[in-house]
């Protein structure tokens, strides 16, 4: 999950495996101030999971979340 520094969440590692799409309710991008670009998925249990925006499954999930 993202690490908060001065209220700016940043990610230092990414989840490798795809999360179940049905478990994800929203997402956000971390700040450009962070050293690693990341997408943070928020699960239906309100857990935050860092993901690599370059991964295919991450892009696919973002697209589907944008459409829903």
């Amino acid at each position: 999950s993202p690490y908060s520094s001065d209220t700016t969440p940043c990610c230092f590692a990414y989840i490798a495996r795809p999360l179940p799409r049905a478990h994800i309710k929203e997402y956000f991008y971390t700040s450009g101030k962070c050293s690693n670009p990341a997408v943070v998925f928020v699960t239906r249990k309100n857990r935050q999971v860092c993901a690599n925006p370059e991964k295919k499954w991450v892009r696919e999930y973002i697209n589907s979340l944008e459409m829903s």
Epitope: Y14, I15, A16, R17, P18, L19, P20, R21, A22, H23, T43, R44, K45, R47, V49, K55, K56, W57, E60, Y61, S64
Partner: antibody, heavy 119, light 108 residues
Framework: QVQLVQSGAEVKKPGASVKVSCKVS????????MHWVRQAPGKGLEWMGG????????IYAQKFQGRVTMTEDTSTDTAYMELSSLRSEDTAVYYC????????????WGQGTTVTVSS | SYVLTQPPSVSVAPGQTARITCGGN??????VHWYQQKPGQAPVLVVY???DRPSGIPERFSGSNSGNTATLTISRVEAGDEADYYC???????????FGGGTKVTVL
């Protein structure tokens, strides 16, 4: 060294249940996703379901929904797969498998447990 | 649900190149993983994320993914490469891992 060691072969009668265990060593069970895959004699691999540690949930393949239960005992680093209402078509080798570190697929596998369903 | 189609068998002479295909609708939009399974043994991951190799897997194993077909290529085939090979993807529509039917590689 990551290792997954499964319980021994089982012979069951139709209608019975079977519970297969998978003991992990070399890492902590709740850090990674444990999945179960089966292979009927002479057939291909079939995913049954798995644990999602990030959300504390287990997901099951639709085909097995309601008939399979996957659990984990983190105190002993052992995962379990229980399949109920067994039929002859459930005769197969059952594998536990897990991802590990930065690899998004099933990097480590148990040796397999043969389950035979016969009257 | 998502369907992966593999040829049942591929034959190749030692030292030659084996190509194993895995077909699926717009499969290039998915990450494909490949497993090798020898008789009586558990599967072994040989390629993940289309073309990456886990440590310990020889460079002779490589993968590609374009259009509706992903391919596992085994260069300079050896007798020890004789096995069944399975492709796998994550289907986000069903939240299921999906395997192809498998391809038996025979080294002549």
């Amino acid at each position: 060294q990551v290792q997954l060691v499964q319980s021994g072969a089982e012979v069951k009668k139709p209608g019975a249940s079977v519970k297969v265990s998978c003991k992990v060593s070399g890492y902590t069970l709740n850090d990674f996703a444990m999945h179960w895959v089966r292979q009927a004699p002479g057939k291909g691999l079939e995913w049954m379901g798995g644990y999602v540690p990030e959300d504390g949930d287990t997901i099951y393949a639709q085909k097995f929904q309601g008939r399979v239960t996957m659990t984990e005992d983190t105190s002993t680093d052992t995962a379990y797969m229980e399949l109920s209402s067994l039929r002859s078509e459930d005769t197969a080798v059952y594998y536990c498998a897990t991802d590990y570190l930065y690899i998004p697929s099933l990097s480590y596998w148990g040796q397999g447990t043969t389950v035979t369903v016969s009257s | 649900s998502y369907v992966l189609t593999q040829p049942p068998s591929v034959s190749v002479a030692p030292g030659q190149t084996a190509r194993i295909t895995c077909g699926g609708n717009n499969i290039e939009s998915k990450s494909v993983h490949w497993y090798q399974q020898k008789p009586g043994q558990a599967p072994v991951l040989v390629v993940y994320d289309d073309s990456d190799r886990p440590s310990g897997i020889p460079e002779r194993f490589s993968g590609s993914n374009s259009g509706n077909t992903a391919t596992l290529t085994i260069s300079r085939v050896e007798a020890g490469d004789e096995a069944d090979y399975y492709c796998q993807v994550w289907d986000s529509n069903t939240d299921h891992w999906v395997f192809g039917g498998g391809t038996k590689v025979t080294v002549l």
